[in-house]
């Protein structure tokens, strides 16, 4: 991406990503420099008759670095610390072309869980306090609670009253999403409230 705005590329933690490099048409390339956060990553000298010379200058990422035939950068086994700014400088006899990228690493969401802190009132109405969580959630995770296709909450928490005398069986579903994955977990209001009722009657006896 040679414009002022870097190309934003999404990578998934533990997987691979390619930063695509476009060559100036019909020009002989003298060398290519890849930089990560302004520090040299690799220096490549292409040859017409033999394999290119590739000098990896960053030992930290070195083992996970690869280059395609067109010298696009491939980074495998992505880590959170790979997040940042990448630049490729293609030098020809007449010019230097710069391509900029921003790599962000996203986690596949894992381990969705719902915790329940519910109360039973004397009128037998059950008030559900549900909290949804996923492992290593960050600010890019969106949570919502749904029932019968309606969104009841846009946060990890849901507070809702359920009256078994007037409400039919009801499932509440937490959906956690980010740009690369989504998970859901459903709980039954009837089951949760029955559990609370048992605890309630046990403490009364």
């Amino acid at each position: 991406q040679s414009s002022l705005t870097p190309l934003m590329v999404n990578g998934i933690l533990g997987e691979s990503v390619t930063l695509p490099l476009e060559f100036p048409a019909g020009e002989k390339v003298n060398f290519i420099t890849w930089l990560f956060n302004e520090t040299s990553l690799a220096f490549i000298v292409p040859h017409e008759t033999k394999s290119p010379e590739i000098h990896v200058t960053n030992p930290k990422q070195g083992k996970r670095l690869n280059f395609t035939q067109s010298y696009s950068l491939q980074l495998s086994n992505l880590k959170m610390e790979d997040t940042g700014s990448y630049r490729a400088q293609i030098s020809t006899k007449t010019s230097a072309k710069l391509s900029s990228y921003t790599l962000r690493i996203l986690r596949q969401l894992r381990n969705i869980q719902v915790t329940n802190h519910s109360q039973l009132f004397q009128n037998m109405t059950c008030e559900l306090h549900l909290t949804c969580s996923v492992e290593d959630a960050d600010d890019n995770v969106s949570f919502r609670w749904e029932a019968l296709g309606n969104t009841l909450s846009s946060q990890p928490n849901l507070t809702v009253s359920w009256d078994p005398r007037i409400s039919s069986e009801q499932d509440y579903t937490c959906i956690a999403e980010n740009a690369v994955s989504n998970l859901s977990f459903s709980v039954s209001a009837q089951k949760l409230c029955e559990d609370v009722k048992i605890q309630y009657t046990d403490t009364k006896m």
Partner: antibody, heavy 118, light 106 residues
Framework: QIQLVQSGSELKKPGASVKVSCKAS????????MNWVKQAPGQDLKWMGW????????RYADDFKGRFAFSLDKSVNTAYLQISSLKAEDTAVYFC???????????WGQGTTVTVSS | QIVLSQSPATLSLSPGERATMSCRAS?????MHWYQQKPGQAPRPWIY???NLASGVPARFSGSGSGTDYTLTISSLEPEDFAVYYC?????????FGGGTKVEIK
Amino acid sequence: QIQLVQSGSELKKPGASVKVSCKASGYTFTNYGMNWVKQAPGQDLKWMGWINTYSGEPRYADDFKGRFAFSLDKSVNTAYLQISSLKAEDTAVYFCARDYGRWYFDVWGQGTTVTVSS
Amino acid sequence: QIVLSQSPATLSLSPGERATMSCRASSSVSHMHWYQQKPGQAPRPWIYATSNLASGVPARFSGSGSGTDYTLTISSLEPEDFAVYYCQQWSSTPRTFGGGTKVEIK
């Protein structure tokens, strides 16, 4: 019906503070995140951040860290935006907006105009 | 942050004409939301999750797209459709809006 009603226009001097309120009605306040959006005169919309209305935890966009503070009064279903050390560039309309999920802002306040002028 | 570029900045059309506006993201996003804003008013929710019309939005509006390219289309412009339309992404924080497309009467 579901609505967000914001406080009235404010005229402030540079260096002063302002507190904008956003009163929610018609839904369970603590179930939906509240976002704040800035629109400077003739400009685009800029997301300032949001507050979790259940936990009270605010999250700010990078450009709005420092002088900006989100808060709640759950007893009256109201969210607040406070701006301190006001500058001329804070002159704008500020909107509160409810997050319906996936950061889709389905209900907006009418906007509060804050003018900073000496 | 993800930059949203809307084009064209202005669409000058007559009632009855078809309007198509684009929103391009600097990185792939899962869905796009759209809002309509008229002078002196708050934005109104218009299309959510790429293609779902908000309550009360007429069927002449439609949304489509995936990845980095999204489109809002008005099949036949009515007088009340002349306004500014903003796209907004939710995939990454900070949530960002596009610069808007103004649909004006020719």
